[in-house]
């Protein structure tokens, strides 16, 4: 996995201005889900990883930002609309609904810091929340009271 | 959620050295729903959130530790061995195992750094690997092959 | 020593399917991404996708219009590439390659496989 | 997607002279662009990468510079065994994308 060597400014700042500035802006993801291209992989498999034999399987999408950190984030995106059949393993149950599951995750974005005469110091982290997708899971769906 | 001001050095230290490695994988999810005290939540509900509607239902319990970032983790915890059956949303589907879906987290732990005569200089991060789990998810069982 | 050795040449009809595989060796497979590149004729280099053996995660290239299918075997430290719905144009030799990563500056390719040619004719 | 050119597309030089080939990005890229050697009939080669750090068992005589838009790749004595294309490559933003290529003979 990728690293930033520091999260400091340039050698020599001073040090004890505050550099992770905190905030709490939701950020929506930069790759909205998209259709499953190959409907073949709406099943669930007997073996390979917990994504691949969920009745709720799904499959990872990458989202890399050069000046975030964590540079490289994952996005579940489900395979099916709803849950295969515990019994068949490919048929969907009507009756489940695959859901994602979603986290606001905090993320740190690099951006230059500024010295007290607006002059270029380094580099600061902004904190900031950033939906991301879990995984997928078989829910029942709600019934609108 | 409260934060540390800095993630550099006190003043004066050299800032050029390696403060931070980071990695990149997801973090649970932060304002997860309370445990539920009662043993009949081995249910699927109807209603309420994605952990308490899951066909795999599970609670979250609170992990914090002051001197780590975040400070504040979440487990998942299942809530049963089984899925849920579908239609009935309360028998349990031997078919189905509800299993935990984990994930090696990265956190950072606050550490005292070391000036270049052993003298304490404010903190530095150490980035480490901190196994969370994130969700249940209904999965069919692995055939040994 | 770290290799990446692919699966030989393809001969393949237009509309047809093939399947690269690419089986590395020498470093610990999960720890690295690999990408795979395309070279036709006479042409440059041409970024297909890449996947993170590790937990799935892909990133494709959309100009591959949804064609493009990656996958990996972690047990058997394998990473394939599959291209359907073949077209003369697809022509040409397929590398695997791994990414590398030093800091936060630097994603590139450090090993690369010795390439596969498809022929779709 | 970023656009990456090369110039020239192809050149001819004596040994022992500088060579320069230059890579321009249709957008700003900052500094995270790679150069890759690909030799006749070979595989291709990681050569530099960010811009201007040089991969392990790479001549010293190989340097990279440049930032934003534009990059190059320098050769301070051409030896016979630089007979390749080189190609520019950003990653800055999914798809990663190369230039066409520069090709160098030897006169």
């Known amino acids: 996995y990728s690293h930033w060597p520091s999260c400091c400014p340039s050698k020599g700042q001073d040090t004890s201005e505050e550099l992770l500035r905190w905030s709490t802006v939701p950020v929506p993801p930069l790759e909205p889900a998209r259709p499953n291209r190959h409907p073949e992989s709406c099943r669930a498999s007997e073996d390979g990883p917990l994504n691949s034999r969920a009745i709720s399987p799904w499959r990872y999408e990458l989202d890399r930002d050069l000046n975030r950190l964590p540079q490289d984030l994952y996005h579940a995106r489900c395979l099916c609309p709803h849950c295969v059949s515990l019994q068949t393993g490919s048929h969907m149950d009507p009756r489940g609904n695959s859901e994602l599951l979603y986290h606001n995750q905090t993320v740190f974005y690099r951006r230059p810091c500024h010295g007290e005469k607006g002059t270029h110091k380094g580099y600061c982290l902004e904190r900031r929340l950033y939906r991301v997708s879990l995984a997928c899971v078989c829910v029942r769906p709600r019934v609108m009271g | 959620y409260s934060h540390w001001p800095s993630c550099c050095p006190s003043k004066g230290q050299d800032t050029s050295e390696e403060l931070l490695r980071w990695s990149t994988v997801p973090v649970p999810p932060l304002e997860p729903a309370r445990p539920n005290r009662h043993p009949e939540s081995c249910r699927a509900s109807e209603d309420g959130p994605l952990n308490s509607r899951a066909i795999s239902p599970w609670r979250y319990e609170l992990d914090r530790d002051l001197n780590r970032l975040p400070q504040d983790l979440y487990h998942a915890r299942c809530l049963c061995p089984h899925c849920v059956s579908l239609q009935t949303g309360s028998h349990m589907d031997p078919r189905g195992n509800s299993e935990l879906l984990y994930h090696n987290q990265t956190v950072f732990y606050r550490r005292p750094c070391h000036g270049e005569k052993g003298t304490h200089k404010g903190y530095c991060l150490e980035r480490r690997l901190y196994r969370v789990s994130l969700a249940c998810v209904c999965v069919r069982p692995r055939v040994m092959g | 020593e770290v290799q990446l050795v692919e699966s030989g040449a393809e001969v393949k009809k237009p509309g047809a399917s093939v399947k690269v595989s690419c089986k590395a060796s020498?470093?610990?497979?999960?720890?690295?991404?690999m990408n795979w590149v395309r070279q036709a004729p006479g042409q440059r280099l041409e970024w297909m996708g890449l996947?993170?053996?590790?937990?799935?995660?892909?990133s494709y290239n959309q100009n591959f219009k949804g064609r493009v299918t990656l996958t990996v075997d972690t047990s058997a430290s394998t990473a394939y590439l599959e291209l359907n719905s073949l077209r003369s144009e697809d022509t040409g030799v397929y590398y695997c390659?791994?990414?590398?990563?030093?800091?936060?500056?630097?994603?590139?390719?450090?090993?690369w496989g010795q390439g596969t040619l498809v022929t779709v004719s | 997607d970023i656009q990456m050119t090369q110039s020239p597309s192809s050149l001819s030089a004596s040994v022992g002279d500088r060579v320069t080939i230059t890579c321009s990005a249709s957008?700003?890229?900052?500094?995270?662009l790679n150069w890759y050697q690909q030799k006749p009939g070979k595989v291709p080669k990681l050569l530099i990468y960010?811009?201007?750090s040089l991969h392990s068992g790479v001549p010293s005589r190989f340097s990279g510079s440049g930032s934003g838009t534009d990059f190059t790749l320098t050769i301070s004595s051409l030896q016979p065994e630089d007979v390749a294309t080189y190609y520019c490559q950003q990653y800055i933003n999914f798809p990663y994308t190369f230039g066409q290529g520069t090709k160098l003979e030897i006169k």
């Open positions: 960010y811009t201007s």
């Open positions: 020498g470093y610990s497979f999960s720890g690295y991404t």
């Open positions: 390659a791994r990414e590398d990563f030093d800091s936060w500056t630097y994603f590139a390719m450090d090993y």
């Open positions: 996947i993170n053996p590790y937990n799935g995660g892909t």
């Open positions: 957008q700003g890229i900052n500094e995270y």
